[in-house]
């Protein structure tokens, strides 16, 4: 009885939360009742353990099929690329912290932080990103430098919509800059790295959005923000990207307590976007001008503009005013990349996947960790893979393109029976000399069945040994391109599938 | 056992303050939406107020809006109701309840109510 | 504010009888109705929710039925601890309203 009526009442929630949909309700009343929703088919989950255990990934998680990883691995491959073509040092770190090292530093996403059960000694969280571990990794082995790279899981407790390539455990790519460096010159690096591999993965076009935390906080100021207000007012400006400026003013108005011709301020600002003459007109503005904060930020932006022009990247930049992303610890510089259209097929839906990367700059963070408050200038970018990885799936899975999932170069296959030793000994020899080489786990394969394996496998290359073949020395060597065979001498079959499968010469 | 017991009441002036607590005990406390019922002596029962298991979420009714605030401490497994200016009509016996199934406004556990009466 | 009409007011019956209780919402609740049961000095006590399901521990006389704006709860066959005040409720949106009550009592 209690089950039924728990599906009863998901039943009746879930049209509760359409209809509020449908009467166009404010955000944050469906966000209520979603929440409700969540919650109720948490428990009919957990009701529904008590009779049958269900057999599925956490909420938020996923597995990832062969097919899946094979996507993900060439995407990382172009990240680790760029990365490392920019000269950068890789490093690891804990996948959780000590809760301390996590605490105050995201704000209002700080909610979203999994803590982990007391195991009776230290306070533990699992990171909720990569960049506070390094700032974390930085003060505590006292360095003044670094440029690394960082590629690793990172854990939210988000409702995430997972069509949307959102998660509760997601990969984070980070790239940052720490220490003492000429202004804008690294921040302009970062720009041109995430917009090296934005290009490079071909996902579509995007733009990226600059903006800056002392633009943000002289513009708060001037428009008569009081100071305990800036950041719960900063993540009301950051939704304008979703919502109507309409929306935010109310949510400013009538949640936090603003006053409306202050909110009417701000949306001057914050409606404008545009590229360094933007720049120029606010360094012009009356009341910014005014202000030494947002005039040190817009000299910034400026300087950094004229790198970018260098870089040849200025066309995908836009300074946006509305920009003013979530965490706390940024001080100053603040990007953020956006698709501005998804590679769609006639009559799909565009895939709505929001940001794609961002970052910018924490002269700040390190400081939190150090005894003695030594701060050390960082600046870095985020790559949204999980975002990514689901736009080139859609991608893939509308091409009905075939994707490898496995390196094999070739298969060893015999055409009678009796021939498994001579498979193990030539597949062992291909081995050692460093070529990636499979065979069926069978004494006696039917011909027919080892080809069919190697086409759907995708496998370029299939070795035939034959009784014949083997009293004559060679082996039948057969293109799943072409379609041609050639017998090839056993002692040149090794440099035979290297010139076909463009491998040079490499051992294990 | 599962039980809520409120506390708090008493006589109070007309435009005075009072603040009422709820001590939960038995279940997950922060699992669960609370709520502030009343019941005016010989009548029928009204809905106050509510509060999220997170704290996110507050209502209050049109009579209370602006004079009373309800909030919770998880920590302390305790719900609290910080009624000021209180008028004469605010005098009743205060329920805190329980969201039944964590989230649906139906109170499925209740405390045994604490008197509050306005009065000069 | 979404009003709730019970009927009747009072009803008066004698043990073994069946009982029927009506409410009525002003406007279209699908099926966000509770029923409480409340004694003199006691808190109300959940019966139904969801208009019709029953409250775990409610002896299943009590039964619920009804969607929109007329819902009805049932007592089968009364017994002596069930003559009390009987309360509706619509949980569909704030504020929640209650039915002004209605009173069972010994025939």
């Known amino acids: 009885a209690d089950r039924a009526a728990l599906e009863e009442l998901v039943r009746l929630q879930g049209a509760h939360v359409r209809g509020l949909k449908e009467q166009k309700a404010s955000a944050e009343q469906i966000e209520e009742e979603v929440t409700k929703l969540l919650k109720l088919k948490a428990q009919l989950g957990q009701d529904e353990g008590k009779q049958k255990f269900v057999l599925k990934t956490p909420k938020g998680t996923r597995d990832y099929s062969p097919r899946q990883m094979a996507v993900r691995e060439k995407v990382f491959d172009v990240i680790i690329r760029c990365f490392k073509r920019h000269g950068a040092e890789v490093i690891d770190t804990p996948v959780f912290e000590l809760k301390e090292t996590l605490t105050g530093k995201y704000g209002e996403d700080s909610k979203l932080i999994y803590d982990l059960k007391d195991q009776g000694g230290e306070l533990l969280s699992l990171r909720y990103d990569l960049t506070v571990p390094f700032a974390r990794y930085l003060a505590m082995n006292k360095l003044t430098n670094i440029k690394r790279y960082h590629i690793a899981k990172v854990y939210r407790r988000d409702n995430p919509a997972m069509t949307r390539g959102r998660y509760r455990e997601f990969y984070q790519c980070d790239f940052d800059i720490a220490g003492q460096f000429d202004p804008m010159i690294p921040d302009a690096e970062c720009l041109k790295i995430m917009c090296e591999i934005l290009s490079s993965l071909q996902i579509g076009n995007f733009l990226v959005k600059v903006n800056d935390r002392r633009i943000l906080d002289g513009m708060f100021a001037v428009c008569g923000v009081p100071d305990s207000k800036f950041r719960t007012i900063c993540s009301s400006v950051d939704k304008l990207d979703k919502v109507s400026w309409e929306e935010v003013k109310n949510e400013m108005v009538g949640e936090k307590g603003l006053a409306p011709e202050v909110a009417d301020r701000i949306g001057d600002y914050v409606q404008q976007h545009g590229g360094v003459s933007l720049v120029e007109q606010l360094l012009q503005d009356p009341k910014l001008s005014q202000n030494k904060q947002a005039v040190e930020g817009l000299g910034d932006l400026k300087l950094l503009f004229e790198y970018l022009i260098l870089f040849g990247i200025d066309d995908k930049i836009s300074f946006d005013l509305s920009l003013a992303r979530g965490l706390d610890y940024y001080t100053g510089v603040i990007y953020e990349a956006v698709l501005l259209q998804m590679p769609t097929q006639a009559g799909e839906e565009p895939l709505g996947v929001g940001s794609i990367a961002a970052g910018g700059r924490y002269d700040g963070l390190v400081g939190m960790f150090d005894p003695k408050g030594r701060k050390v200038p960082c600046v870095g970018l985020s790559i949204g893979v999980e975002r990514i990885f689901s736009i080139v799936e859609q991608r893939l899975e509308a091409s009905e393109e075939k994707v490898r999932t496995t390196e094999t170069q070739v298969l060893v296959a015999s055409a009678q029976k009796k021939l498994l030793e001579e498979r193990l000994k030539l597949v062992s020899e291909l081995w050692d000399a460093g070529i990636k080489a499979e065979l069926l786990y069978k004494k006696n394969p039917k011909l027919l069945n080892q080809l069919q394996y190697w086409e759907e496998a995708g496998i370029p290359l299939v070795a035939i040994i034959g009784e014949q073949e083997l009293r004559d020395g060679v082996i039948k060597l057969r293109s799943v391109a072409s379609r041609e065979e050639v017998d090839v001498r056993r002692e040149d079959l090794v440099e035979e599938i290297r010139r076909r499968t463009n491998q040079p010469l490499s051992t294990c | 056992q599962v039980q809520l017991v409120e506390s708090g009441g008493g006589l109070v002036k007309p435009g005075g303050s009072l603040r009422l607590s709820c001590a939960a005990s038995?279940?997950?406390?922060?699992?669960?939406?609370m709520t502030w019922i009343r019941q005016a002596p010989g009548k029928g029962l009204e809905w106050v107020s509510y509060i999220s298991g997170s704290f996110r979420y507050t209502n209050y009714a049109d009579k209370v809006k602006g004079r009373f605030t309800i909030s919770r401490d998880n920590a302390k497994n305790s719900l609290y109701l910080q009624m000021n200016s209180l008028r004469d009509e605010d005098t009743a016996v205060y329920f805190c309840?329980?969201?039944?199934?964590?989230?649906?406004?139906?109170?499925?556990?209740w405390g045994q109510g604490t008197l509050v009466t306005v009065s000069s | 504010d979404i009003q709730m009409t019970q009927s009747p007011s009072s009803v008066s019956a004698s043990v073994g009888d069946r009982v029927t209780i009506t409410c009525r919402a002003s406007q279209g609740i699908s099926s966000w109705l509770a029923w409480y049961q409340q004694k003199p000095g006691r808190a109300p006590k959940l019966l139904i929710f969801?208009?019709?399901s029953l409250q775990s521990g409610v002896p299943s006389r009590f039964s619920g039925s009804g969607s929109g704006t007329h819902f009805t709860l049932t007592i089968s066959s009364l017994q002596p601890e069930d003559f009390a005040t009987y309360y509706c409720q619509q949980a569909e949106s704030f504020p929640y309203t209650f039915g002004q009550g209605t009173k069972l009592e010994i025939k």
């Open positions: 309840a329980r969201y039944v199934y964590q989230v649906v406004a139906i109170g499925d556990l």
């Open positions: 969801a208009a019709s």
């Open positions: 038995g279940f997950t406390f922060s699992d669960y939406y």
